[in-house]
Amino acid sequence: SGTTNTVAAYNLTWKSTNFKTILEWEPKPVNQVYTVQISTKSGDWKSKCFYTTDTECDLTDEIVKDVKQTYLARVFSYPAGNVESTGSAGEPLYENSPEFTPYLETNLGQPTIQSFEQVGTKVNVTVEDERTLVRRNNTFLSLRDVFGKDLIYTLYYWKSSSSGKKTAKTNTNEFLIDVDKGENYCFSVQAVIPSRTVNRKSTDSPVECMGQEKGEFRE
Protein backbone atom coordinates (compact mmCIF):
# COMPACT_ATOMS: atom_id res chain seq x y z
CA SER A 1 0.00 0.00 0.00
CA GLY A 2 2.77 2.44 -0.94
CA THR A 3 4.88 2.50 2.25
CA THR A 4 7.61 0.08 1.25
CA ASN A 5 10.27 2.81 1.42
CA THR A 6 9.05 4.28 4.73
CA VAL A 7 10.94 3.32 7.87
CA ALA A 8 9.78 3.62 11.43
CA ALA A 9 11.50 6.09 13.73
CA TYR A 10 13.82 4.60 16.34
CA ASN A 11 15.96 5.68 19.31
CA LEU A 12 13.22 7.98 20.56
CA THR A 13 14.83 10.00 23.34
CA TRP A 14 13.59 12.72 25.67
CA LYS A 15 15.98 15.66 26.10
CA SER A 16 14.78 17.87 28.91
CA THR A 17 16.42 20.55 31.07
CA ASN A 18 14.48 22.72 33.52
CA PHE A 19 11.33 21.48 31.74
CA LYS A 20 12.38 22.66 28.27
CA THR A 21 11.61 19.33 26.62
CA ILE A 22 12.44 18.03 23.17
CA LEU A 23 11.82 14.57 21.74
CA GLU A 24 14.60 13.38 19.43
CA TRP A 25 14.70 10.34 17.18
CA GLU A 26 16.40 8.72 14.21
CA PRO A 27 16.86 8.29 11.25
CA LYS A 28 17.39 11.43 9.23
CA PRO A 29 14.52 11.19 6.75
CA VAL A 30 15.00 10.05 3.17
CA ASN A 31 11.81 10.48 1.16
CA GLN A 32 9.71 10.54 4.29
CA VAL A 33 8.33 12.97 6.86
CA TYR A 34 7.29 12.68 10.50
CA THR A 35 4.45 13.77 12.76
CA VAL A 36 4.62 13.51 16.54
CA GLN A 37 1.77 12.83 18.94
CA ILE A 38 1.86 13.21 22.71
CA SER A 39 -0.55 12.22 25.43
CA THR A 40 -0.81 11.57 29.13
CA LYS A 41 -1.62 8.03 30.22
CA SER A 42 -5.31 8.84 30.47
CA GLY A 43 -5.54 11.64 27.91
CA ASP A 44 -6.13 12.03 24.19
CA TRP A 45 -3.37 12.17 21.61
CA LYS A 46 -2.34 15.63 20.43
CA SER A 47 -0.42 16.05 17.19
CA LYS A 48 2.67 18.27 16.99
CA CYS A 49 5.41 19.01 14.45
CA PHE A 50 3.28 18.05 11.46
CA TYR A 51 4.94 16.38 8.47
CA THR A 52 8.38 17.56 9.47
CA THR A 53 11.74 16.57 8.06
CA ASP A 54 13.32 17.37 11.43
CA THR A 55 14.28 14.58 13.81
CA GLU A 56 13.27 16.51 16.89
CA CYS A 57 10.09 18.06 18.21
CA ASP A 58 9.74 20.60 21.00
CA LEU A 59 7.03 19.31 23.33
CA THR A 60 7.58 21.83 26.10
CA ASP A 61 4.19 23.52 25.61
CA GLU A 62 2.45 20.22 26.23
CA ILE A 63 4.39 18.87 29.20
CA VAL A 64 4.36 22.14 31.16
CA LYS A 65 0.57 21.87 31.42
CA ASP A 66 1.15 19.35 34.22
CA VAL A 67 4.76 18.47 34.96
CA LYS A 68 3.78 15.72 37.41
CA GLN A 69 1.90 13.75 34.76
CA THR A 70 3.54 10.90 32.87
CA TYR A 71 3.68 11.43 29.10
CA LEU A 72 4.04 9.13 26.14
CA ALA A 73 4.89 10.30 22.63
CA ARG A 74 4.87 8.53 19.30
CA VAL A 75 6.44 9.40 15.98
CA PHE A 76 4.60 8.60 12.76
CA SER A 77 6.45 8.09 9.47
CA TYR A 78 4.84 9.06 6.15
CA PRO A 79 6.14 8.91 2.57
CA ALA A 80 7.17 12.40 1.44
CA GLY A 81 4.53 13.85 -0.88
CA ASN A 82 2.00 11.18 0.01
CA VAL A 83 1.14 11.71 3.64
CA GLU A 84 -2.30 10.10 3.23
CA SER A 85 -0.61 6.78 2.53
CA THR A 86 -0.88 4.14 5.25
CA GLY A 87 0.90 0.97 6.19
CA SER A 88 -0.23 -2.56 5.43
CA ALA A 89 -2.46 -2.59 8.51
CA GLY A 90 -4.23 0.53 7.29
CA GLU A 91 -2.36 3.06 9.43
CA PRO A 92 1.02 4.79 9.16
CA LEU A 93 4.14 3.33 10.74
CA TYR A 94 4.86 4.70 14.20
CA GLU A 95 7.15 4.10 17.15
CA ASN A 96 6.44 4.82 20.83
CA SER A 97 8.76 6.80 23.08
CA PRO A 98 9.70 5.75 26.60
CA GLU A 99 7.39 7.21 29.24
CA PHE A 100 8.49 10.58 30.59
CA THR A 101 7.54 12.27 33.87
CA PRO A 102 8.97 15.81 33.76
CA TYR A 103 8.93 16.45 37.52
CA LEU A 104 10.96 13.32 38.16
CA GLU A 105 13.16 13.30 35.09
CA THR A 106 13.91 16.74 33.66
CA ASN A 107 17.59 17.51 34.03
CA LEU A 108 18.53 20.27 36.43
CA GLY A 109 20.21 23.03 34.47
CA GLN A 110 23.55 24.47 35.49
CA PRO A 111 22.82 26.95 38.29
CA THR A 112 24.21 30.46 38.44
CA ILE A 113 25.43 32.40 41.45
CA GLN A 114 23.48 35.64 41.32
CA SER A 115 25.38 37.52 44.00
CA PHE A 116 27.35 37.34 47.19
CA GLU A 117 27.58 39.92 49.93
CA GLN A 118 30.03 39.98 52.81
CA VAL A 119 29.15 41.59 56.11
CA GLY A 120 31.98 41.16 58.59
CA THR A 121 32.66 37.44 58.95
CA LYS A 122 29.45 36.34 57.18
CA VAL A 123 28.85 35.96 53.47
CA ASN A 124 25.39 35.68 51.95
CA VAL A 125 25.50 33.76 48.66
CA THR A 126 22.39 33.92 46.47
CA VAL A 127 21.61 31.43 43.71
CA GLU A 128 19.66 32.73 40.72
CA ASP A 129 16.14 31.30 40.75
CA GLU A 130 15.88 30.37 37.12
CA ARG A 131 12.60 30.93 35.33
CA THR A 132 11.03 27.86 33.74
CA LEU A 133 8.36 27.59 31.03
CA VAL A 134 5.91 26.14 33.53
CA ARG A 135 3.01 28.53 34.03
CA ARG A 136 0.54 29.18 36.81
CA ASN A 137 -2.08 31.92 36.59
CA ASN A 138 -0.45 33.25 33.41
CA THR A 139 2.97 33.73 35.01
CA PHE A 140 6.09 31.68 34.48
CA LEU A 141 7.22 29.77 37.55
CA SER A 142 10.79 29.62 38.80
CA LEU A 143 12.58 26.37 39.50
CA ARG A 144 12.00 26.93 43.22
CA ASP A 145 8.29 27.57 42.61
CA VAL A 146 7.99 24.22 40.85
CA PHE A 147 10.12 22.04 43.11
CA GLY A 148 9.68 23.82 46.45
CA LYS A 149 11.64 22.15 49.25
CA ASP A 150 12.30 19.12 47.02
CA LEU A 151 15.14 21.16 45.51
CA ILE A 152 18.27 21.86 47.49
CA TYR A 153 21.51 23.59 46.60
CA THR A 154 24.94 22.44 47.67
CA LEU A 155 27.52 25.20 48.00
CA TYR A 156 31.23 24.55 47.64
CA TYR A 157 33.46 27.33 48.93
CA TRP A 158 37.15 27.74 49.55
CA LYS A 159 39.76 30.36 50.28
CA SER A 160 41.30 31.72 47.09
CA SER A 161 44.66 31.03 48.70
CA SER A 162 44.01 27.34 49.49
CA SER A 163 42.56 24.20 47.96
CA GLY A 164 40.62 22.90 50.98
CA LYS A 165 36.91 23.11 50.24
CA LYS A 166 33.94 23.43 52.57
CA THR A 167 30.29 22.80 51.84
CA ALA A 168 26.86 23.95 52.97
CA LYS A 169 23.30 23.13 51.93
CA THR A 170 20.12 25.15 51.60
CA ASN A 171 16.54 24.42 50.60
CA THR A 172 16.07 28.09 49.78
CA ASN A 173 18.23 29.95 47.27
CA GLU A 174 20.44 31.58 49.88
CA PHE A 175 23.41 30.52 51.96
CA LEU A 176 24.77 32.35 54.97
CA ILE A 177 28.27 31.13 55.72
CA ASP A 178 31.06 32.01 58.12
CA VAL A 179 34.32 33.22 56.62
CA ASP A 180 37.63 34.48 57.92
CA LYS A 181 37.93 38.25 57.80
CA GLY A 182 40.37 39.55 55.24
CA GLU A 183 40.29 36.35 53.16
CA ASN A 184 38.89 36.10 49.65
CA TYR A 185 36.70 33.08 48.88
CA CYS A 186 35.49 31.34 45.76
CA PHE A 187 32.06 29.76 45.37
CA SER A 188 30.33 27.16 43.22
CA VAL A 189 26.86 25.67 43.60
CA GLN A 190 25.09 22.51 42.50
CA ALA A 191 21.36 21.80 42.41
CA VAL A 192 20.15 18.48 43.84
CA ILE A 193 16.79 16.78 44.21
CA PRO A 194 17.43 14.23 47.00
CA SER A 195 14.22 12.28 46.47
CA ARG A 196 15.05 11.38 42.87
CA THR A 197 16.69 8.22 41.64
CA VAL A 198 17.74 9.60 38.22
CA ASN A 199 18.96 13.01 37.04
CA ARG A 200 19.47 13.95 40.69
CA LYS A 201 22.23 16.55 40.37
CA SER A 202 23.06 19.46 38.11
CA THR A 203 26.50 20.29 36.88
CA ASP A 204 28.36 22.80 39.05
CA SER A 205 27.78 26.48 38.47
CA PRO A 206 30.62 28.61 37.13
CA VAL A 207 32.99 29.57 39.94
CA GLU A 208 32.60 33.08 41.33
CA CYS A 209 35.26 34.63 43.55
CA MET A 210 35.30 37.55 45.95
CA GLY A 211 37.09 40.53 44.55
CA GLN A 212 35.16 40.16 41.32
CA GLU A 213 32.12 42.12 40.13
CA LYS A 214 29.25 40.04 41.57
CA GLY A 215 30.25 40.62 45.17
CA GLU A 216 29.71 43.36 47.66
CA PHE A 217 31.62 44.02 50.86
CA ARG A 218 30.38 45.84 53.94
CA GLU A 219 32.08 46.22 57.30
Epitope: T154, T167, I177
Partner: antibody
Framework: EVQLVESGGGLVQPGGSLRLSCAAS????????MHWVRQAPGKGLEWVGW????????IYDPKFQDRFTISADTSKNTAYLQMNSLRAEDTAVYYC??????????WGQGTLVTVSS | DIQMTQSPSSLSASVGDRVTITCKAS??????LSWYQQKPGKAPKLLIY???GEPEGVPSRFSGSGSGTDFTLTISSLQPEDFATYYC?????????FGQGTKVEIK
Protein backbone atom coordinates in the same frame (compact mmCIF):
# COMPACT_ATOMS: atom_id res chain seq x y z
CA GLU B 1 19.73 -4.15 45.22
CA VAL B 2 21.93 -1.35 46.53
CA GLN B 3 25.12 -2.58 48.14
CA LEU B 4 28.36 -1.04 49.40
CA VAL B 5 31.32 -3.28 50.15
CA GLU B 6 34.47 -1.92 51.78
CA SER B 7 37.82 -3.65 51.48
CA GLY B 8 41.51 -2.93 52.01
CA GLY B 9 41.59 -2.81 55.79
CA GLY B 10 44.17 -4.64 57.84
CA LEU B 11 47.19 -4.24 60.08
CA VAL B 12 49.60 -1.45 59.23
CA GLN B 13 52.57 0.02 61.08
CA PRO B 14 52.59 3.61 62.36
CA GLY B 15 53.67 5.93 59.57
CA GLY B 16 52.41 3.48 56.96
CA SER B 17 49.77 3.90 54.27
CA LEU B 18 46.61 2.05 53.29
CA ARG B 19 44.02 2.44 50.55
CA LEU B 20 40.45 1.44 51.30
CA SER B 21 37.93 0.68 48.56
CA CYS B 22 34.17 0.99 48.56
CA ALA B 23 32.62 -0.98 45.70
CA ALA B 24 29.06 0.04 44.91
CA SER B 25 26.43 -1.99 43.12
CA UNK B 26 22.76 -1.41 42.35
CA UNK B 27 23.26 2.30 41.60
CA UNK B 28 25.67 4.66 39.89
CA UNK B 29 27.96 6.46 42.33
CA UNK B 30 28.14 9.56 40.13
CA UNK B 31 24.47 10.23 40.94
CA UNK B 32 25.18 10.54 44.67
CA UNK B 33 27.71 11.87 47.16
CA MET B 34 29.90 9.23 48.79
CA HIS B 35 31.22 9.56 52.34
CA TRP B 36 33.74 7.90 54.60
CA VAL B 37 32.90 7.63 58.30
CA ARG B 38 35.05 5.92 60.92
CA GLN B 39 34.48 4.44 64.36
CA ALA B 40 37.29 3.75 66.82
CA PRO B 41 36.81 0.68 69.05
CA GLY B 42 34.10 1.41 71.64
CA LYS B 43 33.71 5.00 70.41
CA GLY B 44 31.21 7.00 68.41
CA LEU B 45 30.94 7.77 64.70
CA GLU B 46 33.32 10.32 63.18
CA TRP B 47 32.87 11.87 59.73
CA VAL B 48 35.99 11.81 57.54
CA GLY B 49 34.90 13.39 54.27
CA TRP B 50 32.93 13.14 51.05
CA UNK B 51 33.34 13.08 47.29
CA UNK B 52 31.03 13.96 44.46
CA UNK B 53 32.22 11.28 42.03
CA UNK B 54 30.73 13.09 39.05
CA UNK B 55 33.03 16.09 39.29
CA UNK B 56 35.67 15.00 41.80
CA UNK B 57 34.81 17.64 44.41
CA UNK B 58 36.04 16.53 47.81
CA ILE B 59 35.35 17.85 51.30
CA TYR B 60 37.21 16.72 54.42
CA ASP B 61 37.06 17.24 58.11
CA PRO B 62 40.08 19.57 58.44
CA LYS B 63 41.76 17.14 60.84
CA PHE B 64 42.11 14.64 57.98
CA GLN B 65 42.82 17.05 55.14
CA ASP B 66 46.59 16.59 55.11
CA ARG B 67 46.80 12.81 55.46
CA PHE B 68 43.67 11.39 53.82
CA THR B 69 42.56 11.60 50.20
CA ILE B 70 39.16 10.53 48.87
CA SER B 71 38.84 9.64 45.21
CA ALA B 72 36.48 7.74 42.95
CA ASP B 73 36.57 5.77 39.73
CA THR B 74 33.15 5.98 38.11
CA SER B 75 34.06 3.33 35.54
CA LYS B 76 34.57 0.88 38.43
CA ASN B 77 31.71 2.38 40.47
CA THR B 78 34.10 2.54 43.40
CA ALA B 79 35.15 5.18 45.93
CA TYR B 80 38.51 5.13 47.69
CA LEU B 81 40.10 6.43 50.87
CA GLN B 82 43.87 6.80 50.73
CA MET B 83 45.34 7.11 54.23
CA ASN B 84 48.95 8.18 54.76
CA SER B 85 51.14 8.73 57.84
CA LEU B 86 48.88 6.48 59.87
CA ARG B 87 48.86 6.72 63.67
CA ALA B 88 47.65 4.42 66.43
CA GLU B 89 44.62 6.70 66.90
CA ASP B 90 43.52 5.99 63.31
CA THR B 91 42.67 2.44 64.39
CA ALA B 92 38.97 2.13 63.61
CA VAL B 93 36.30 0.50 61.50
CA TYR B 94 35.96 2.58 58.32
CA TYR B 95 32.55 2.76 56.66
CA CYS B 96 31.53 4.20 53.33
CA UNK B 97 28.03 5.58 52.97
CA UNK B 98 25.82 6.84 50.17
CA UNK B 99 24.38 10.34 50.59
CA UNK B 100 21.23 11.49 48.77
CA UNK B 101 22.02 15.05 49.89
CA UNK B 102 19.33 14.65 52.56
CA UNK B 103 20.58 11.58 54.45
CA UNK B 104 23.00 8.65 54.38
CA UNK B 105 20.66 5.91 53.20
CA UNK B 106 23.07 3.01 52.62
CA TRP B 107 26.20 2.04 54.50
CA GLY B 108 28.83 -0.63 53.87
CA GLN B 109 29.60 -3.31 56.45
CA GLY B 110 32.86 -1.56 57.37
CA THR B 111 36.51 -2.57 57.18
CA LEU B 112 38.82 -2.65 60.19
CA VAL B 113 42.09 -0.74 60.09
CA THR B 114 44.55 -1.49 62.89
CA VAL B 115 47.62 0.73 63.25
CA SER B 116 50.18 -0.95 65.49
CA SER B 117 53.83 -1.86 65.56
CA ASP C 1 32.47 23.96 63.31
CA ILE C 2 29.05 22.92 64.52
CA GLN C 3 29.03 20.82 67.69
CA MET C 4 26.24 18.31 68.29
CA THR C 5 25.52 17.63 71.96
CA GLN C 6 23.52 14.46 72.40
CA SER C 7 21.88 13.42 75.64
CA PRO C 8 21.68 11.26 77.58
CA SER C 9 24.84 9.30 76.78
CA SER C 10 23.06 6.15 77.99
CA LEU C 11 19.72 5.16 79.41
CA SER C 12 18.06 2.06 80.81
CA ALA C 13 14.48 1.35 79.82
CA SER C 14 11.97 -1.45 79.69
CA VAL C 15 10.04 -2.89 76.77
CA GLY C 16 6.99 -0.69 76.20
CA ASP C 17 8.61 2.46 77.61
CA ARG C 18 8.56 5.77 75.78
CA VAL C 19 12.13 6.88 75.15
CA THR C 20 13.33 10.38 74.20
CA ILE C 21 16.82 11.29 72.99
CA THR C 22 17.85 14.86 72.29
CA CYS C 23 20.46 16.53 70.12
CA LYS C 24 21.41 20.17 70.44
CA ALA C 25 23.35 21.96 67.71
CA SER C 26 25.76 24.75 68.61
CA UNK C 27 24.02 26.90 65.98
CA UNK C 28 21.06 26.77 63.59
CA UNK C 29 21.26 23.78 61.24
CA UNK C 30 17.77 24.31 59.77
CA UNK C 31 16.43 20.87 58.86
CA UNK C 32 19.71 19.13 58.07
CA LEU C 33 19.58 16.53 60.81
CA SER C 34 19.19 12.77 60.57
CA TRP C 35 19.12 9.95 63.14
CA TYR C 36 20.82 6.55 62.91
CA GLN C 37 20.57 3.32 64.88
CA GLN C 38 23.61 1.10 65.33
CA LYS C 39 23.79 -2.38 66.80
CA PRO C 40 27.07 -3.95 67.96
CA GLY C 41 29.26 -5.08 65.07
CA LYS C 42 26.87 -3.63 62.47
CA ALA C 43 26.79 -0.55 60.27
CA PRO C 44 24.54 2.36 61.24
CA LYS C 45 21.02 2.34 59.82
CA LEU C 46 18.98 5.41 58.83
CA LEU C 47 15.97 6.06 61.08
CA ILE C 48 14.85 9.66 60.53
CA TYR C 49 15.86 12.38 58.07
CA UNK C 50 15.13 16.12 57.69
CA UNK C 51 14.26 15.92 61.44
CA UNK C 52 10.92 14.23 60.73
CA GLY C 53 11.04 12.15 57.54
CA GLU C 54 10.79 8.39 57.93
CA PRO C 55 12.35 6.06 55.36
CA GLU C 56 10.44 3.03 54.16
CA GLY C 57 10.76 0.06 56.48
CA VAL C 58 11.34 2.09 59.65
CA PRO C 59 8.65 1.29 62.25
CA SER C 60 6.20 4.10 63.01
CA ARG C 61 7.16 4.04 66.69
CA PHE C 62 10.25 6.04 65.71
CA SER C 63 9.61 9.75 65.20
CA GLY C 64 11.64 12.91 65.02
CA SER C 65 10.89 16.51 65.89
CA GLY C 66 12.60 19.85 66.34
CA SER C 67 14.15 22.55 64.21
CA GLY C 68 16.96 25.06 64.30
CA THR C 69 19.12 23.88 67.17
CA ASP C 70 17.01 21.45 69.22
CA PHE C 71 16.03 18.03 67.95
CA THR C 72 14.38 14.98 69.49
CA LEU C 73 14.17 11.30 68.59
CA THR C 74 11.25 9.52 70.24
CA ILE C 75 10.58 5.80 70.44
CA SER C 76 6.92 5.63 71.47
CA SER C 77 6.96 2.05 72.75
CA LEU C 78 10.37 0.43 73.09
CA GLN C 79 10.67 -3.03 71.55
CA PRO C 80 13.34 -5.69 72.27
CA GLU C 81 15.01 -5.05 68.90
CA ASP C 82 15.39 -1.32 69.71
CA PHE C 83 18.18 -1.84 72.25
CA ALA C 84 21.06 -0.21 70.38
CA THR C 85 23.07 2.99 70.15
CA TYR C 86 21.51 6.03 68.47
CA TYR C 87 23.34 8.90 66.76
CA CYS C 88 22.25 12.23 65.35
CA UNK C 89 24.12 13.73 62.39
CA UNK C 90 24.13 17.31 61.15
CA UNK C 91 24.87 17.52 57.45
CA UNK C 92 23.99 21.14 56.77
CA UNK C 93 27.58 22.27 56.57
CA UNK C 94 31.03 20.76 56.71
CA UNK C 95 32.57 19.31 58.67
CA UNK C 96 29.53 17.09 59.21
CA UNK C 97 29.25 16.13 62.86
CA PHE C 98 27.68 13.28 64.79
CA GLY C 99 26.36 13.44 68.30
CA GLN C 100 28.29 11.39 70.86
CA GLY C 101 25.67 8.62 70.77
CA THR C 102 23.03 7.35 73.20
CA LYS C 103 23.18 3.73 74.28
CA VAL C 104 19.72 2.34 75.07
CA GLU C 105 20.04 -0.61 77.44
CA ILE C 106 17.57 -3.03 78.99
CA LYS C 107 16.54 -2.12 82.53
Amino acid sequence: EVQLVESGGGLVQPGGSLRLSCAASGFNIKDYYMHWVRQAPGKGLEWVGWIDPENGNTIYDPKFQDRFTISADTSKNTAYLQMNSLRAEDTAVYYCARDTAAYFDYWGQGTLVTVSS
Amino acid sequence: DIQMTQSPSSLSASVGDRVTITCKASRDIKSYLSWYQQKPGKAPKLLIYYETGEPEGVPSRFSGSGSGTDFTLTISSLQPEDFATYYCLQHGESPFTFGQGTKVEIK
